[in-house]
């Protein structure tokens, strides 16, 4: 069964996939595809790396982490409900039938509908509600959108919740590292 990951409409989705290169720069081809992993390669390829670089990608799909160190986790930008489904990460380890393949299920939830702010409009316009969470590579910024009035304590609480959520994901995903060599 697939490991399940969740994101909201309009957010960036993160699908983890890792391997440990045998030596620095000794990379292994990896493909990401929409749909479960087929018998060879990936179906409906959205991104592909070779021994040196990312050699194929499509819009909204990118590697946020350091793929040269084996972090080939996929980021899908600005997701919609249509992005829901199974994704395949295939690590094409050299040898006879050595591939490692992972099916990851992405569940997209509708964005939370919240009432527009009624007070402090100038504050809202001047300071968009953005929280930065720890990511794998460049920090990901998650926009909270039109929230009702909120105080600094609530912002701190939200930041902690986002951080803890990401940390939980990190801990859950830490067992999915493939060591090569």
């Amino acid at each position: 069964s697939e490991v399940e990951y969740r994101a909201e409409v309009g957010q960036n989705a993160y699908l983890p996939c890792f391997y440990t290169p045998a030596a620095p720069g000794n990379l292994v081809p990896v493909c990401w595809g929409k749909g479960a992993c087929p018998v060879f390669e990936c179906g409906n390829v959205v991104l592909r790396t070779d021994e040196r670089d990312v050699n194929y990608w499509t819009s909204r799909y990118w590697l946020n982490g350091d793929f040269r160190k084996g972090d080939v986790s996929l980021t899908i930008e600005n997701v919609t409900l249509a992005d829901s489904g199974i994704y395949c990460c295939r690590i094409q380890i050299p040898g006879i039938m050595n591939d490692e393949k992972f099916n990851l299920k992405l569940v997209i939830k509708p964005a939370k509908v919240t009432p527009a702010p009624t007070r402090q409009r100038d504050f809202t316009a001047a300071f968009p509600r953005m929280l930065t969470t720890r990511g794998h590579g460049p920090a990901e910024t998650q926009t909270l959108g039109s929230l009702p009035d909120i105080n600094l304590t609530q912002i701190s609480t939200l930041a902690n919740e986002l951080r803890d959520s990401r940390l939980a994901n990190d801990l859950r995903d830490s067992g999915a590292t493939i060591r090569i060599g």
Partner: antibody, heavy 117, light 107 residues
Framework: EVQLLESGGGLVQPGGSLRLSCAAS????????FSWVRQAPGKGLEWVSA????????YYADSVKGRFTISRDNSKNTLYLQMNSLRAEDTAVYYC??????????WGQGTLVTVSS | DIVMTQSPSSLSASVGDGVTITCQAS??????LNWYQQKPGKAPKLLIY???SLPIGVPSRFSGSGSGTDFTLTISSLQPEDFATYYC?????????FGQGTKLEIK
């Protein structure tokens, strides 16, 4: 023109060896996985072996594992199948086929391998 | 190995007829089902991939459907050049496996 052209088939005795070649033209050979698929006389299709675009990942059917070796030379746009310890049941037409988006979308014309004493 | 079972094994029909060939997988194959057409002495030709997608150049009278374990190939109005043997093939589990074939003959 996009095409695959097999060669190297023939009559060989049981226990003998043969090397098949598949020359590709008209497309970016190194970008694709390739397979060998065989068809015994009057029978259906049987997948034999596959190889990744860079040639470093290979795959074999149990029936040929340890006897057949698939390889490719991307500088020559050529796919190979080295067949050793041949048996009567290996008698078939051998096709090379390009694998694209989960289907074998381009096939050669086939080359006949007959294993008989 | 995933076993692919085609039915019928042979079929007689006339030009202009519509025909359906079925293929059943021994386990779910996530829609990774291809159909091929083969004429005597020739290589197979890909007709349908991923259960229902037509490669460029394949006439629209050919269509595929199905999911999970059960799939069908439909030819809406047979043409003289359609009389051939048809194979299904799964591309999900290792190794890739083919059905035993369905021979479509002129009635």
């Amino acid at each position: 023109e996009v095409q695959l052209l097999e060669s190297g088939g023939g009559l060989v005795q049981p226990g003998g060896s043969l090397r098949l070649s598949c020359a590709a033209s008209g497309f970016s050979f190194s970008s694709f996985y390739f397979s060998w698929v065989r068809q015994a006389p009057g029978k259906g299709l049987e997948w034999v072996s596959a190889i990744s675009g860079n040639g470093r990942s290979t795959y074999y059917a149990d029936s040929v594992k340890g006897r057949f070796t698939i390889s490719r030379d991307n500088s020559k746009n050529t796919l190979y199948l080295q067949m050793n310890s041949l048996r009567a049941e290996d008698t078939a037409v051998y096709y090379c086929a390009r694998y694209y988006n989960t289907g074998f979308d381009l096939w050669g014309q086939g080359t006949l391998v007959t294993v008989s004493s | 190995d995933i076993v692919m079972t085609q039915s019928p094994s042979s079929l007689s029909a006339s030009v202009g007829d519509g025909v359906t060939i079925t293929c059943q997988a021994s386990e779910a194959i996530y829609g990774y089902l291809n159909w091929y057409q083969q004429k005597p002495g020739k290589a197979p030709k890909l007709l349908i991939y991923a259960a229902s997608s037509l490669p460029i150049g394949v006439p629209s009278r050919f269509s595929g459907s199905g999911s999970g374990t059960d799939f069908t190939l439909t030819i809406s109005s047979l043409q003289p050049e359609d009389f051939a043997t048809y194979y299904c093939q799964q591309a999900y589990g290792f190794p890739p496996t083919f059905g035993q074939g369905t021979k479509l003959e002129i009635k």
